[in-house]
Interface confidence: low
C-alpha cells in the first residue's frame, strides 16, 4: 500500500481466483484513542472500533471510502483505491492502446519546437467518474523538473457505436536550452483513477524525438506568365524555434487532384519556394520537418490551385 | 562563446557541405547498426546515453546562436561569461568565439575519430564478421577535420592487448553512435547559422 | 555499403511488357525521405528519368512514358520493379536503378542492365 | 517539363588546363541542379548536387555553380581519368530531366 495524495491509497493487488488479497492497518487521524468506530463509504454498518482497523483486501468490495468517527463526528478519512495486477502485468483497462507508433501507446506526445514544452494526449471510452493526473521530470534517478497543467477534455468523437474522449496536458520543462543535446529523456507519468481503480501509464521521450513542427504559414501562389506553373512561397510557423538558420526546417511540396487516386508530384526542398505545375481543380500542400533530425513531418498546409 | 553575426567567410561553404555528408553518414551507419545488430540493445530508448565529449568539449555552449545568449537555461553550463562588446565580432576570420566553437567541433570530431577507429580494429577481430565501421563515414570525418583546418597533435589509437568483448563492444558502437548521430546534427546546425550569418 | 542491381530479359519483342527488377542493400525504403528510380540510356544518346518511388509509396513517372510504366516495390525483399508495356525499339537501351535521398540527387546506380527490342 | 541544354556538345582541353562545362534550364530551378560523370561501358557518377555541393570523395578540382537558370561545372586543372561525358540534372520538379552530355576529351 502507497499514499497517491493526502488521505488516498493505493492497495496493489494480485488479481487471480481466490487470490489471499493484502492485509492494511488503517489509522484513524485524531489524538482520540477511546470510542472511535469505522464505516465504509456511505454505509452505517460498524466494520470495528479503535484507533486502527485490520481489513483484507481482495476486490473491488473491500476497496472506497473508510472513515473513522466518535460519536456521531467524522474523525478522518482514507480512500482506498485497487491496483490490478494481472500475470505480472498491471491492468490497462482505463486507457486505450492508440497502438501507433507501436503496440501498447496509451500516451502520445509532441513538441512544436525545441522550447521545452510538449503536449501529450491519451483516450479512454470512459466518460465519467474519471480523474487524471500527471507528473513530468527529466530523467528518473535525479530528476529535473517539468511542470505540467492539469488534463482536459480536448475531443469527442463517435466511433462506431462507441464514444471516445481524448484528454490532453501540456508539459513545460523548467529550465531548456533549445539547443542543448538531450542526454536525459523527459518521463510523463499519468495516474488515472477510475471510480476505485487505479492505472498509471509512462512515457519516456527526448524532445528531439517527438517534435512536429506546425505547418508552414502564408502559402501563396504566384502565377507565371505564360505558363501553367506557379511559384509556391510560405513562411516558417511562428512557433517554429529561432533562429531558424540554426534550427531549419526542409519542405515537402505535394500538388495532388481533386481525386486521391490521382497522381501526386511532390517536390522537396530546404528553400520556402517552389515552383510547380498547378492543374485544374488540384491543390497545393506543404509541410515541414527539422532539416538535420528527421521526427514527424507537420500536417498540410494547403491551398487551391484556382 | 556565441557565434558571432557577421558576412559570411567564402570558406564556410565546404564546411557546411562536409557536415552535411557527416550526418547523413553517421545517420546511414547508424541505421546499418540498428538493422544488423537488431538483437542487441541499439535503438534510442535501449542504449544509455552517454557522451564521450563530456567535460572535454563544449560544443553546445562555445557555438550557441547569438539570440540564444539571453536565455539563462543556455547558459548555465557556462564557465566563461559571454563578450558583448561588439568590436571584436566584427569580422568572423578575427572572432575568438568563433575560433572556440569551430575548435571545440575539430576536438569532438578527433576524439570520435580515434574510438571509432579503435572500435574498428576490434570488430575486425570479430570471428563472427558481423558488422563494421563505414569506411565513408570515416572519410567524412576527416574531410570535415580537414575542412576545418585546425593543427593539433596526432592522438595515438588505443591499443589492447586483451582479447575484446564483441558483444560489449557492438553495445559500445551503438551508444557512439548515437551520440555521434546527436552531435552531428548540432554541427549541421552550428555549420548552417554561420553560412546565413 | 549501399548497392543496387537491375535484374530483367536482355531481348523483348516489339508489344511485349518489359519488367525490369532492382535489388537494393545497404538502405531501406522503410524509413525516411529514400526513394529509388529508374532511368534509361538509349545507345550513344543522353539519360532520360522514367519513374520514382518513395518510402511511403508515392509514385510518380515521366508524363511522355506515364501510360506504360508501373512502379512498385518490395519492401521485405530489398527491390523496386519497373514494369514498360508495348515495348518498341525505340526503347532500345540501358536501364538504371538509382537511389535518390532527399538533398543528394541520384547518388547511387546500378551497373544497367542492356535491353534490346527487336523481332 | 524543364529542358536542360548543355553547351558545347563536347570539349577538348590539354592535360592541366580548366574545362567549363555550361548548362541553361529553359526556366528557373532554383539550385536543384546535379552534375554527373559517365565513363564508357560504366554507369554515370554524381559529382555536384544542390548545384555547387560536392559529393563525397569527388576530388575539389571539380566545382560547380549558378543559381535559377544558368549552371556552370568546373574541371580547374584536368586529369586524364576526367575524359568522360558530363550530364546536368534537374530534380526541382517533375518530371527530372537531364542535358544532352558535354564529351570531355584531351587534346
Known amino acids: 500500500i502507497w499514499e497517491l495524495k493526502k488521505d488516498v491509497y493505493v492497495v496493489e493487488l494480485d488479481w487471480y481466483p481466490d487470490a489471499p488479497g493484502e492485509m492494511v492497518v488503517l489509522t484513524c487521524d485524531t489524538p482520540e484513542e477511546d470510542g472511535i468506530t469505522w464505516t465504509l463509504d456511505q454505509s452505517s454498518e460498524v466494520l470495528g472500533s479503535g484507533k486502527t482497523l485490520t481489513i483484507q483486501v481482495k476486490e473491488f468490495g473491500d476497496a472506497g471510502q473508510y472513515t473513522c468517527h466518535k460519536g456521531g463526528e467524522v474523525l478522518s478519512h482514507s480512500l482506498l483505491l485497487l491496483h490490478k495486477k494481472e500475470d505480472g502485468i498491471w491492468s490497462t483497462d482505463i486507457l486505450k492502446d492508440q497502438k501507433e507508433p507501436k503496440n501498447k501507446t496509451f500516451l502520445r506526445c509532441e513538441a512544436k519546437n525545441y522550447s521545452g514544452r510538449f503536449t501529450c494526449w491519451w483516450l479512454t471510452t470512459i466518460s465519467t467518474d474519471l480523474t487524471f493526473s500527471v507528473k513530468s521530470s527529466r530523467g528518473s534517478s535525479d530528476p529535473q523538473g517539468v511542470t505540467c497543467g492539469a488534463a482536459t477534455l480536448s475531443a469527442e468523437r463517435v466511433r462506431g457505436d462507441n464514444k471516445e474522449y481524448e484528454y490532453s496536458v501540456e508539459c513545460q520543462e523548467d529550465s531548456a536550452c533549445p539547443a542543448a543535446e538531450e542526454s536525459l529523456p523527459i518521463e510523463v507519468m499519468v495516474d488515472a483513477v477510475h471510480k476505485l481503480k487505479y492505472e498509471n501509464y509512462t512515457s519516456s521521450f527526448f524532445i528531439r524525438d517527438i517534435i512536429k513542427p506546425d505547418p508552414p504559414k502564408n502559402l501563396q501562389l504566384k502565377p507565371l506568365k505564360n505558363s501553367r506553373q506557379v511559384e509556391v512561397s510560405w513562411e516558417y510557423p511562428d512557433t517554429w524555434s529561432t533562429p531558424h538558420s540554426y534550427f531549419s526546417l526542409t519542405f515537402c511540396v505535394q500538388v495532388q487532384g481533386k481525386s486521391k487516386r490521382e497522381k501526386k508530384d511532390r517536390v522537396f526542398t530546404d528553400k520556402t519556394s517552389a515552383t510547380v505545375i498547378c492543374r485544374k481543380n488540384a491543390s497545393i500542400s506543404v509541410r515541414a520537418q527539422d532539416r538535420y533530425y528527421s521526427s514527424s513531418w507537420s500536417e498540410w498546409a494547403s491551398v487551391p490551385c484556382s | 562563446r556565441n557565434l558571432p553575426v557577421a558576412t559570411p567567410d567564402p570558406g564556410m561553404f565546404p564546411c557546411l557541405h562536409h557536415s552535411q555528408n557527416l550526418l547523413r553518414a553517421v545517420s546511414n551507419m547508424l541505421q546499418k547498426a540498428r538493422q544488423t545488430l537488431e538483437f542487441y540493445p541499439c535503438t534510442s530508448e535501449e542504449i544509455d546515453h552517454e557522451d564521450i565529449t563530456k567535460d572535454k568539449t563544449s560544443t553546445v555552449e562555445a557555438c550557441l546562436p547569438l539570440e540564444l545568449t539571453k536565455n539563462e537555461s543556455c547558459l548555465n553550463s557556462r564557465e566563461t561569461s559571454f563578450i558583448t562588446n561588439g568590436s571584436c565580432l566584427a569580422s568572423r576570420k578575427t572572432s575568438f568565439m568563433m575560433a572556440l566553437c569551430l575548435s571545440s567541433i575539430y576536438e569532438d570530431l578527433k576524439m570520435y575519430q580515434v574510438e571509432f577507429k579503435t572500435m574498428n580494429a576490434k570488430l575486425l577481430m570479430d570471428p563472427k564478421r558481423q558488422i563494421f565501421l563505414d569506411q565513408n563515414m570515416l572519410a567524412v570525418i576527416d574531410e570535415l577535420m580537414q575542412a576545418l583546418n585546425f593543427n593539433s597533435e596526432t592522438v595515438p589509437q588505443k591499443s589492447s592487448l586483451e582479447e575484446p568483448d564483441f558483444y560489449k563492444t557492438k553495445i559500445k558502437l551503438c551508444i557512439l553512435l548515437h551520440a555521434f548521430r546527436i552531435r552531428a546534427v548540432t554541427i549541421d546546425r552550428v555549420m548552417s547559422y554561420l553560412n546565413a550569418s | 555499403e549501399v548497392t543496387l542491381r537491375e535484374s530483367g530479359p536482355a531481348l523483348v519483342k516489339p508489344t511485349q511488357t518489359l519488367t525490369l527488377t532492382c535489388t537494393f542493400s545497404?538502405?531501406?525504403?522503410?524509413?525516411?525521405?529514400?526513394?529509388v528510380s529508374w532511368i534509361r540510356q538509349p545507345p550513344g544518346k543522353a539519360l532520360e528519368w522514367l519513374a520514382h518511388?518513395?518510402?511511403?509509396?508515392?509514385?510518380y513517372y515521366n508524363p511522355s512514358l506515364k501510360s506504360r510504366l508501373t512502379i512498385s516495390k518490395d519492401t521485405s525483399k530489398n527491390q523496386v520493379v519497373l514494369t514498360m508495356t508495348n515495348m518498341d525499339p525505340v526503347d532500345t537501351a540501358t536501364y538504371y536503378c538509382?537511389?535518390?535521398?532527399?538533398?543528394?540527387?541520384?547518388?547511387?546506380w546500378g551497373q544497367g542492365t542492356t535491353v534490346t527490342v527487336s523481332s | 517539363d524543364v529542358v536542360m541544354t548543355q553547351s558545347p556538345d563536347s570539349l577538348a582541353v590539354s592535360l592541366g588546363e580548366r574545362a567549363t562545362i555550361n548548362c541553361k534550364a529553359s526556366?528557373?530551378?532554383?539550385?536543384?541542379v546535379a552534375w554527373y560523370q559517365q565513363k564508357p561501358g560504366q554507369p554515370p557518377k554524381l559529382l555536384i548536387y544542390?548545384?555547387?555541393n560536392r559529393y563525397t570523395g569527388v576530388p575539389d578540382r571539380f566545382s560547380g555553380s549558378g543559381y535559377g537558370t544558368d549552371f556552370t561545372l568546373t574541371i580547374s586543372s584536368l586529369q586524364a581519368e576526367d575524359v568522360a561525358v558530363y550530364y546536368c540534372?534537374?530534380?526541382?520538379?517533375?518530371?527530372?530531366?537531364f542535358g544532352g552530355g558535354t564529351k570531355v576529351e584531351i587534346k
Open positions: 540534372q534537374q530534380d526541382y520538379n517533375s518530371p527530372w530531366t
Open positions: 538509382t537511389r535518390r535521398g532527399i538533398r543528394s540527387a541520384m547518388d547511387y
Open positions: 545497404g538502405f531501406s525504403l522503410r524509413k525516411s525521405v529514400m526513394g
Open positions: 544542390y548545384a555547387s
Open positions: 518511388i518513395y518510402w511511403d509509396d508515392d509514385k
Open positions: 526556366q528557373s530551378v532554383s539550385n536543384d
